[in-house]
Interface confidence: low
Amino acid sequence: KIDACKRGDVTVKPSHVILLGSTVNITCSLKPRQGCFHYSRRNKLILYKFDRRINFHHGHSLNSQVTGLPLGTTLFVCKLACINSDEIQICGAEIFVGVAPEQPQNLSCIQKGEQGTVACTWERGRDTHLYTEYTLQLSGPKNLTWQKQCKDIYCDYLDFGINLTPESPESNFTAKVTAVNSLGSSSSLPSTFTFLDIVRPLPPWDIRIKFQKASVSRCTLYWRDEGLVLLNRLRYRPSNSRLWNMVNVTKAKGRHDLLDLKPFTEYEFQISSKLHLYKGSWSDWSESLRAQTPEEEPTGMLDVWYMKRHIDYSRQQISLFWKNLSVSEARGKILHYQVTLQELTGGKAMTQNITGHTSWTTVIPRTGNWAVAVSAANSKGSSLPTRINIMNLCEAGLLAPRQVSANSEGMDNILVTWQPPRKDPSAVQEYVVEWRELHPGGDTQVPLNWLRSRPYNVSALISENIKSYICYEIRVYALSGDQGGCSSILGNSKHKAPLSGPHINAITEEKGSILISWNSIPVQEQMGCLLHYRIYWKERDSNSQPQLCEIPYRVSQNSHPINSLQPRVTYVLWMTALTAAGESSHGNEREFCLQGKAN
């Protein structure tokens, strides 16, 4: 009932709670002397379903048969309408439409840890839409029973609050859940289990790692477990990896030796526990332990390359370059590099430790036979030294690779190809492809890049430190014993027409011809490798087409003679530059009048 119903009653047959699809009879009846004043025959009783009028009748009572009610709650209200007055609410009723509970499915129970309590979960089945009580019953040995209830249509979990103990681990317990509402009841299938079946150990805790004698090969993982744990599984991985290494151990008693860890690597370790070989379930994984393994002596050898530069008749500059060891080769933090320079005949040697750089430059005499050895050192020791005899890398002309070409290969890649040298190609032990940004001044501070290629290869894709619209000087060296030959070419990964033309800085007269000098185009405006310069000239104030002279680009060249100008005629001159993609705009214009000889 929804109010005091002083004026009348609403009755519902067969019940306020009905099965979905059932029919109900609703009767609204007025109490004596509660009709319309003086006009009892004019009583108009109206039945509302929520706010919608569904039936009416003149008199003291109204009967209505209602079908097709939806799941859930439907509100019916009876009102009285008298002439010349508002409708008066008489009484109302709620009808609850639902279904009997389905059989609860998948009943499963678990006790978290040896000291935990037994809790069970199940699948309710479909919503009954009614007040439904769930009763969970657990029966054990010696006729012991426990019972817990919850009264919520969403109930699918109950904790008994009792702790099963391992005194008799094989004793059977049986759990059953029963759902009851006004329309019926249903019980799950019983679930029978033992202590060992349902106890899920707590995850291991207090995980530690020890490295005996600071060595990665002597590593022991320690942890603490609940007392009855028989099995453990360990998983571990480098922190930057997604794949776990797994190890299963029996009767570990809180320790296990790990034999395959890499040095100087941060690892993540987790452990899980189980009480029985084939009964029960694994615990959750423990919290992660993160630990770095100790360093070990570096393995591998440095990749070393060098450059020679003539200074004067007696001295030369040697620049050594080397690449960092990979993380797996360095096996620790590289503290310094040791460079030893030795004159092989006189036995003089000089050793220097280099920190923070992967290059070293020194000046040595041009005479004598020189060798270098470079190694990397961490806190545990040094790598094997890489030894190189300093020779003239381009001295053996017959070893020079032939037909060297450099072509763009996608974004920021250059494909370098060559043919083996004329001299017996089988004499080649390896090729080295070297590249560096082209700087007109031949700047030795420009970083050097190189890669090594096997003697049977005739191409290499270079991609490291390659930028678009930059010209690279590329050299291919063929090495054979203590001899080397080389060929060079310019190449770029991407090019377009230069952004500006050369700037003419001087025009001088020499024996009836002129010499034009210019400033190089700034590297960032060249937009790739320059192929040609063009010098244009025409008579001042003339509308004729200019004449031009095309000069192949040379890195060091910045002047050129022209001998086809007429004396005592004023000319306007300018220059452009060309890449494979096109011609630049004009550089500056200069006027010049060749004086020549008077007739």
Epitope: L71, Q105, N106, E123, R124, G125, R126, D127, I153, Y154, D156
Partner: nanobody, 123 residues
Amino acid sequence: QVQLEESGGGLVQAGGSLRLSCAASGRTFSSYVVGWFRQAPGKEREFVGRISWSGARTYYADSVEGRFTISRDNAKNTVYLQMNSLKPEDTAVYYCAADLKWEVLLSEHYEYWGQGTQVTVEP
């Protein structure tokens, strides 16, 4: 009353993956079975798969078995359809539907429906 809204559709290359979501309003959502259906242009609506109230049970049409996975997060009132190894023939509007009954395959037996989300798989 349950309102459903699908999201996550889009354009994908054959062999790729998509995850559709079906978000619901209403406190009783965890009591509903949720089914996924799809309708390609000019074809009848087709059953894809369904998931039980708790997520413990799933059932799939043969055409998607092994490639599609349905899961649910009742705390977020959301059901998901993870679609892997997509094929051009998976192109369709995908709908989610909810009902209190488990043994429901026919779309007309589902009580509540979403508006659908378009999935296009390019060859």
